[in-house]
């Protein structure tokens, strides 16, 4: 008789990540019989939700459940009908939510109610929605990149199964740049961490990690834009504001309520004689990093050493690994390539900030106007932030890794975050058996 | 085991406020939502509103200007009030909860408390 | 606000019969719709859920069907602890909205 083909024994789990920007779903997939197993987790679906990020629906809280339906029909699509009830869905909020809960707990818990009454609408196993905290989301993002990199793994091959890998178990360190915040977070060498805020301990399948993680809140890049402006008009004559993140010929009426709507921009609030500016570009890469360098306190420092605002950061250990925005801003710029120095991506940021408007605009014609016009002003800030924030040096600006997928996953807080909410690292090594029960059938 | 048991009077004078209360266990209430249902010969299954487990509430709109409901998480109770009550208010009310945090039908239902509108 | 129309307030079956519920909603509400049994002083029980995922313990000749504004419930070879009264809800929008019920009784 003909071997019939056994059902395959899997499971899924959903993450939705929603940001201050936007919310995205993600889907795993992993074998039933290999939970614990590192590395067999894996993406299956990325559905980017249409719309702004959830905190953008304080006034509009009804519109949330159609906001959710496309994704989560997507959802359904995917995961097999027999599968739906068990699968497991979480949704994480992040800096978006974090700055709307410093305004407004009340607001914040509104837009989370409201979300799980339309996440729970569906026929999966709707674990909740919270808003994480930035420690948890770098926490995540390194167990996220190390998880796919192979490294929690005991058994050292001799070949490499990903790009970025070393034979080494040494974990990578992980920079991840969302719109409201970014966090960093690295295995540092021999050295204790000054402030218990920043430490973290983890037994990962039988070892110990002392991790280092800080998540600067309004350091995302659009915060960090909001922050730039509500700076500079301080000192501006009049309602123009010649700006020299942004390329020569552009031109951007920016509304000074707007300004002031985040409490990232409350340290530079100030009464203007006017309710509107309009940004002028000029395009000058040099002049943009000074202007952005103004957001970093380096001045004051209690810990042996600092990034900035006085927040401890311990010297840099090891490769890093560098996602969400300061990938996808660096890949626009094609700059993530291994072979490109610290200086040529210098040299190409100066090139690209003084190309006038109506070039760029020509030149990339398929892209939203309102991200294009952003470009320079992001990578700029990724440079400052990564070279006199983290203190990265010409050489070892080499140890950074732009990654967008590692083995066709997202690099990014939420596979972490699922692999640990669904008990699938274990503290312990597991017992390895010389065959699995599928290797019977 | 999730339960719900609801308490209250079972006879309320015309004009008067009824306030019922739902004492729950298996489950907390900061982790789940509860809704309220009210069942009556005239007109069938209603449902009146629910407290979230943040505590924001929805209330059905021919009601909302005479119900309250509101919480206490640590006491694990749910108390509903509503006010001016007519004769057509004569019903068997329910707490009720969905199987997870924020379901909006009813996997569990406490066994409900008949009351009765009338001088 | 959504009405849920359950258009026969009584119907008769026998033990073994194979008998359909219906519900029909007066706008789309998708598959945001769950079936209840209730029968007499007790608290309604849910059946269905999503349309036509069966809450689980739910014996599985019950099975739900439909989307949109058409719903059913079917119960194939119906057993006497089956005799009751089964309402639907839709659970798309607030307020949510219940059928009127469908009495099942023996022939």
């Known amino acids: 008789t003909q071997n019939k083909a056994l059902p395959e024994n899997v499971k899924y789990g959903i993450v939705l990540d929603a940001g201050s920007s936007h919310t995205s779903l993600y889907i795993y997939k992993w074998p039933a019989e290999k939970e614990n197993d590192t590395g067999v987790v894996h993406q299956v679906e990325e559905c980017r939700v249409k719309g702004p990020g959830i905190s953008k629906f304080v006034q509009k809280v009804n519109e949330i459940g159609i906001y959710l339906t496309d994704c989560m029909e997507r959802a359904r699509e995917v995961i097999p009908r027999s599968q739906h009830q068990e699968t497991p869905v979480y949704l994480g909020a992040t800096a978006g939510m974090r700055l709307l809960r410093m305004e407004s707990e009340e607001l914040a818990d509104r837009v989370l109610d409201v979300v799980e009454r339309s996440l729970s609408n569906y026929p999966f196993d709707f674990q909740g929605a919270r808003i994480i905290t930035g420690q948890e989301e770098g926490a995540y993002g390194w167990i996220t990149i190390n998880y796919l990199l192979g490294k929690f793994s005991q058994k050292t091959r001799w070949f490499s199964i990903v790009p970025y890998e070393t034979n080494n178990q040494e974990t990578f360190g992980a920079l991840d740049l969302g719109g409201a915040s970014t966090q960093v977070t690295f295995v540092p060498q021999n050295q204790t961490i000054e402030s218990p805020d920043n430490a973290l301990q983890f037994r990962l399948y039988g070892k110990d990690y002392n991790v280092y993680t800080h998540s600067f809140l309004c350091y995302g890049k659009d915060q960090a834009l909001w922050q730039k402006l509500a700076k500079d008009i301080q000192v501006a004559s009049n309602e123009i504001l010649r700006d020299p993140c942004f390329h020569p010929g552009y031109k951007k009426v920016v509304n000074v309520s707007d300004l002031y709507k985040t409490p990232c921009t409350k340290r530079f609030e100030m009464t203007l004689p006017f309710q509107q500016f309009e940004i002028q570009g000029i395009g000058n890469y040099q002049q943009c990093h000074q202007s952005i360098l103004e957001l970093f306190n380096t001045s004051y420092c209690p810990y042996s050493q600092c990034a900035f605002n006085g927040i401890f950061l311990p010297p840099l250990q090891g490769d890093f690994g560098a996602f969400s925005a300061f990938y996808f801003v660096m890949k626009f710029l094609n700059l993530t390539s291994e072979k490109v120095s610290q200086e040529k991506v210098t040299e190409m940021m100066k090139k690209f900030c003084a190309q006038p408007w109506e070039e760029i605009k020509t030149s990339y014609a398929g892209v939203k106007e309102k991200y294009l016009s952003e470009y320079c002003f992001s990578g700029t800030y990724i440079l400052s932030l990564l070279l006199q924030g983290y203190h990265f040096t010409a050489d070892s600006w080499e140890h950074i890794h732009f990654i967008g997928k590692i083995q066709g996953s997202d690099a990014g807080w939420t596979l972490g975050y699922m692999l640990n909410l669904t008990n699938m690292i274990p503290a312990e090594q597991p017992l390895s058996t010389p065959l699995s029960h599928s290797t019977y059938v | 085991d999730v339960q719900l048991q609801e308490s209250g009077p079972s006879l309320v004078q015309p004009s008067q406020s009824l306030s019922i209360n739902c004492t729950v266990s298996g489950f907390s209430l900061s982790s789940y939502g509860v809704h309220w249902v009210r069942q009556s010969p005239g007109k069938g299954l209603e449902w009146l509103g629910v407290?979230?487990?943040?505590?924001?509430?929805d209330y059905n709109a021919a009601f909302m200007s005479r119900l309250s409901i509101t919480k206490d998480n640590s006491k694990s109770q749910v108390f509903f009030k509503m006010n001016r009550l007519q004769a057509d208010d004569t019903a068997t009310y329910y707490c009720?909860?969905?199987?997870?945090?924020?379901?909006?039908?009813?996997?569990?239902w406490g066994q409900g408390t008949l009351v009765t509108v009338s001088a | 606000d959504i009405v849920m129309t359950q258009s026969h307030k009584f119907m008769s079956t026998s033990v073994g019969d194979r008998v359909s519920v219906t519900c029909k909603a007066s706008?789309?509400?998708?598959?945001?719709v769950a079936w209840y049994q209730q029968k007499p002083g007790q608290s309604p029980k849910a059946l269905i859920y999503s349309a036509s995922y069966r809450y689980s313990g739910v014996p599985d000749r019950f099975t739900g069907s439909g989307s949109g504004t058409d719903f059913t419930l079917t119960i194939s070879n119906v057993q006497s602890e089956d005799l009751a009264e089964y309402f639907c809800?839709?659970?798309?929008?607030?307020?949510?909205?219940f059928g009127a019920g469908t009495k099942l009784e023996l022939k």
């Open positions: 706008q789309n509400v998708g598959t945001n």
């Open positions: 809800q839709q659970y798309n929008s607030y307020p949510l909205t």
């Open positions: 009720a909860k969905g199987i997870s945090t924020a379901t909006s039908w009813f996997a569990y």
């Open positions: 407290i979230w487990r943040r505590g924001s509430t």
